[in-house]
Structures are given as C-alpha cells and as structure tokens.
Interface confidence: medium
C-alpha cells in the first residue's frame, strides 16, 4: 500500500540471478485480524474524539482543537479503508472491489497518513507555542490561524498522495484468476526509469511523511520538556511526581509515534539502499518478508492516537462517561447541563475558567502560572 511498487529484480542482474526470492508467505488471518481490530478501535476512538470536540461550545474551543479534530478525521478516514485491505490480505492478495475502490482506498490511506502526521506536527507546534512561547505567539494560535494551517496540511496531504491515485490500478498480472491492486508505472516509465520513480516517491514519502515531521515534533517536545523542567525547579518538591508524569506523557507521545512509524520507514529505506549496496540475499529477503508487519504496526498508530491524545485528559473520560450514561435511566441524576459543562473542550484542561492570569479567550499571559495540575496532555 505504499506509493512504490516493484523495484526488486528488475534492477541489478546480480541480485536477480543470485537471490532466491520466493512468494511471500501469507500471515494467514493475523494481519487481517489486526487490521479489523485497528478499524474497530480506530472508528470508536476517533469517533469519540470528534464527538467530544464538536459537542463543546465554540467559545470554549482552543487552537489545539482544530488539530485534534483533524487528526481524528484523518485517522478515521484512514481506518475505514482497513476492512478492504483486510479482505485483500485474507484472500491472499486478490482484490474483489474493482479499480476505482483500489485507487480511492489507496489514495485515502496516503492522504490520511500524511494528514495525521502533519496534524501531530501541528499539535506539537501548538503545544510549543502554548507552553514555551505563550505571550509572544498568542496571536499565532488564534482559531483562524489554526483553520488556515489545517487547510494547508490537508491540501498538502492530498497533493503528496496524488501519485497513488494516478498509478494505482487493478490487474490480472499473469492472466491468472487473482486480481491485484498495485502500482503500475508503465504509462510514464520504462523498465530503466522505473527505478527513478520508485526512489523518488519512496524517499519523498519517508522524508515528508516521517523524517521532517518527526524532527519538528522532537524539537518541539525538547523545548517543551525544557520549559516544564524549568517551571518545576521553581516549585516545591511535591511537584516532582507531577513533573515525572507530564514528561512521561510527552515521551510516550514521541516514542509511540517513532515506534509505530520507524520500522515501516526504516525497512523501506534499507530496501531501497539494498539496490545500491547489494545486501546479502537473506537480509534482502528478510526486509521483504518483514515489511507487511511493519506496515501493520504503522497502521496501529491510527487507533492509538485517541488514547494517547485524549484519554490522558480526565475531562475526556468524563465526557465519554456522560455520553454512555445519557442513554441510561440510572444516570438521570446527572444534570445534562452539568455534564455538558464538564466535557466542554478536552483541550482546555483547566479546573478554572479564564482567571486573572488569562488573556482574551483563555490564552495564558504569564509563563510561570501554567496550570499543570490537571496533567492533561493538551493543556492551554
């Protein structure tokens, strides 16, 4: 499901004639089962995130909310295609859904791969502005700026994924009974120039879809951690426990993103390098066989994000509880307005409203009064 297609064996006669490649041994029901689990958790989790964000009143939403909503939409659009890929994998790579769905579902996967990565980056940068430079960049974080940034990231994601829409097709590659959904470069490339397309798309997707965003995220969280550490140094010793928890949340975010996407991009990059460096056959074959599992792990990220970004916030949990309770008579004691108030916006993790240290719309005006007491991930 990557942009690239085949660049094994076409290129480098030595590789082709000496390495004993064989048909990929199917994982059976394992990968399809994981895809379906990600689909179920992803639709539920991201659906809850969207519900929580959009049920809050407009004035109580913060700049981060637009990224959180976008991230949830991206992940949601991503995971709804997974039943198709689960079916395809389970049928031992036989695509029964037609060319249009092959193109569209492949395209949606990549639009939303980019979009979700960009959303995480936007959210990280928003956290950076909120925590490290809250005064100087308060205007940058207005809802209008957030909307513009979101529009840009979606357009960029849509454009970056376009090669998938163009080159994906279905084909009975050997006039056998199976139909594959694959990348076909024959309209633009000869065998010799296929390599350039493969490397170009592979390198660009890894650079733009992983290396650059991850570098930005890492940089943002480095400064965030530095700022938090600075704040806690000024506070009393009881703050140490809070500091550890908050820093661990940030570490979890970055590490989870890395753990989910690193294997995919690393294996892909090593494989591309193999055509230049001529890895031993066993290693080349290992990369080929491990790649579907790396893809699977990267897809898991789309159902983890709601848990990582929302479930650390007690208000999100309250909102979920109130939603579950709404349909049950035993919860009638909880007033609707109260539950609505409590779940206002899970990105504003304050126990108080805009107080003396708050600017217009609840923006923080003094660095030293950042309310970490909620230990919420997306604190404003």
């Amino acid at each position: 499901m990557e942009e690239g297609g085949d660049f094994d064996n076409y290129y480098g006669a030595d590789n082709q004639s000496e390495c004993e490649y064989t048909d990929w041994k199917s994982s059976g029901a394992l990968i399809p089962a994981i895809y379906m689990l990600v689909f179920l958790l992803g639709t539920t989790g991201n659906g809850l995130v969207l519900w929580t964000v959009f049920r809050s009143s407009r004035e109580k939403r913060r700049s981060a909310d637009i990224f959180i909503a976008s991230l949830a939409v991206a992940d949601l659009t991503f995971v709804v295609t997974l039943p198709l890929w689960a079916t395809y994998t389970y049928r031992d790579y036989d695509w029964p859904f037609g060319t249009f769905s092959c193109k569209l579902s492949s395209y949606l996967i990549f639009v939303n791969m980019y979009a979700s990565v960009f959303c995480l980056t936007g959210l990280s940068f928003d956290r950076y502005l909120a925590i490290v430079r809250p005064v100087a960049n308060a205007r940058l974080r207005l809802r209008v700026s957030g909307a513009v940034a979101t529009a840009v990231l979606w357009v960029l994601a849509a454009l970056l994924a376009m090669p998938v829409m163009v080159f994906r097709t279905t084909g009975d590659l050997e006039n056998t009974t199976k139909v594959q959904c694959y990348m076909d470069y024959s309209m633009v490339a000869t065998v010799s120039s296929d390599w350039a397309w493969e490397v170009g798309l592979g390198v660009s997707s890894t650079t733009v879809g992983f290396v650059v965003p991850f570098t930005i995220m890492l940089t943002c969280y480095f400064f965030i951690a530095q700022t938090i550490a600075g704040h806690f140094r000024k506070e009393r010793i009881e703050g140490l426990r809070k500091r550890r928890r908050l820093l661990s949340i940030i570490v979890v975010l970055v590490v989870t993103f890395a753990l989910c996407w690193m294997p995919y991009h690393l294996v892909k990059t090593l494989y591309m390098l193999g055509s230049l460096l001529h890895w031993p056959c066993d290693f080349d074959l290992f990369l080929m066989n491990v790649f579907p599992y790396c893809t699977c792990i990267s897809y898991v990220n789309s159902c983890l994000n709601p848990f990582l970004y929302a479930f650390f916030d007690p208000r999100f949990r309250q909102a979920c509880t109130s939603m579950l309770c709404c349909g049950q008579s035993r919860c009638a004691g909880t007033s609707h307005s109260s539950s609505g108030e409590k779940s206002a916006s899970y990105s504003s993790g304050h126990s108080q409203g805009p107080g003396p240290n708050m600017g217009k719309g609840g923006e923080q005006m003094h660095e030293k009064s950042i309310p970490y007491s909620q230990e919420t991930l997306v604190v404003d």
Epitope: M1, E2, E3, G4, G5, D6, F7, D8, N9, Y10, Q16, S17, E20, Y21, T22, D23, W24, T89, D92, Y93, D94, L173, E174, N175, T176, K178, Q180, C181, Y182, M183, S186, T190, V191, S192, K268, Y271, L287, M288, F291, P292
Partner: antibody
Amino acid sequence: EVQLVESGGGLVQPGGSLRLSCAASGFTFSSFWMSWVRQVPGKGLEWVANIKQDGSEKYYVDSVKGRFTISRDNAKNSLYLQMNSLRAEDTAVYYCARDRFGYSFYDKGVRYYYGMDVWGQGTTVTVSS
Amino acid sequence: DIQMTQSPSSLSVSVGDRVTITCRASQGIRNDLGWYQQKPGKAPKRLIYATSSLQSGVPSRFSGSGSGTEFTLTISGLQPEDFATYYCLQHNSYPRTFGQGTKVEIK
C-alpha cells in the same frame, strides 16, 4: 554449480504414457517455480507448463491441458511431467527450466515473471507407431 | 493467446556488425519480454529479461529495448560466438509464448 538434468524420455506409441523427471542441484529447489519447455526438432520453442514452489499453482499450454500433469517433490529436488494420451505432435526435446520472478516489495501478492534463467540439457520424447 | 512475431527469420552478417532483431506482440505486454540464445544441440540461454535487464554473465554488447508491442534485441559488434538462433519470449501472461526464432548466420 546450478544444474538441471532431465531423464525419462524415449520412444512411445500414440496414446501411450511417459513420465519425465528433472533432478535439480546447486540451488534451493523449493524456492523456485519450475517449467517444462519443449522443442520440435528443427522448430521453435514452446512453453508447456509451470508449477509454483509448493505445487499449489500449475499452468499449462492449451494443447496439453488434461493430458499432461506437472508435479514436484521438494524433498527429492525433483520436477516431473506425467504425459498421457501422447500424440505424434508431442514429439520433441523436453527441457526442464527454472523460472524467475520479481516480487513487489510494497505490493505483496504481486509478482513479475522474468522467464527461465537455468535450463537442463533436454530429454527426447518420440511418439510414433 | 498472445502471438509473438519475430523478424527477420534469418540474417547473414559479418563479425563486428551491428545486429537488430525485432519482436512484435499481438497485444500490449508492457515490458514483459525476454530474449534467449540457442546454439545447435544446446539448451537455450537467457540473455535479457524484462525487456532491457541483462542476465548476469551476458556481455554488454547485448541490449534490449521497447515497450508495449514492439521490442528489439541489439548486438553491437557481433562476435564469432554470437552466431546462433535468437528467440523472444513474452512473460506477460499465460500461456508463455515464444517468437518463431531468428537465425543469425555468418556471411
């Protein structure tokens, strides 16, 4: 050294049967698709059949479908061609050959056939009364 | 079935000459074509696969090109050991089909 050695050819009457064997050495036989190709003396080459590594997929040219059966024994590093209901037009030199495929890294299940890279010396089958 | 038509069926050339053999497919076969060399009493030997990829150990004077329905094998600077019969093979779909062959003879 990679080697394929065919055996089992000979003279047979029309309607008769023959079983060709191909012994493989010098490579991991179980990792490759294998083919049979024939050549009528003084004429061109004709692909006959091929078989997947585990024997789960087999393909034949229309002229031999229902009469010829390709099979393999990976434990013995051997490929076979069972020929039944033989006709005069089946007279040919039969070559056993190793198939090569390119496999898509990204699109699992997609493979590209690259022809036959190693051939045996051939075994002659003559169908005559 | 895809029909493969080779031309010429034979040609007489001298050592050092440039030789071009053409293979036409009855329908589009992308880049799925190979070239084989066969000497009398010997098994065929693969020269080129996937239109232009050179088999390991094959001299660089052999090259392939083309796409879709028209393909070419070029031998730049024919050597004495190159006098043989050359076949194209489409490996796009089943059944695999060979061209009828081109015999390259000494002038």
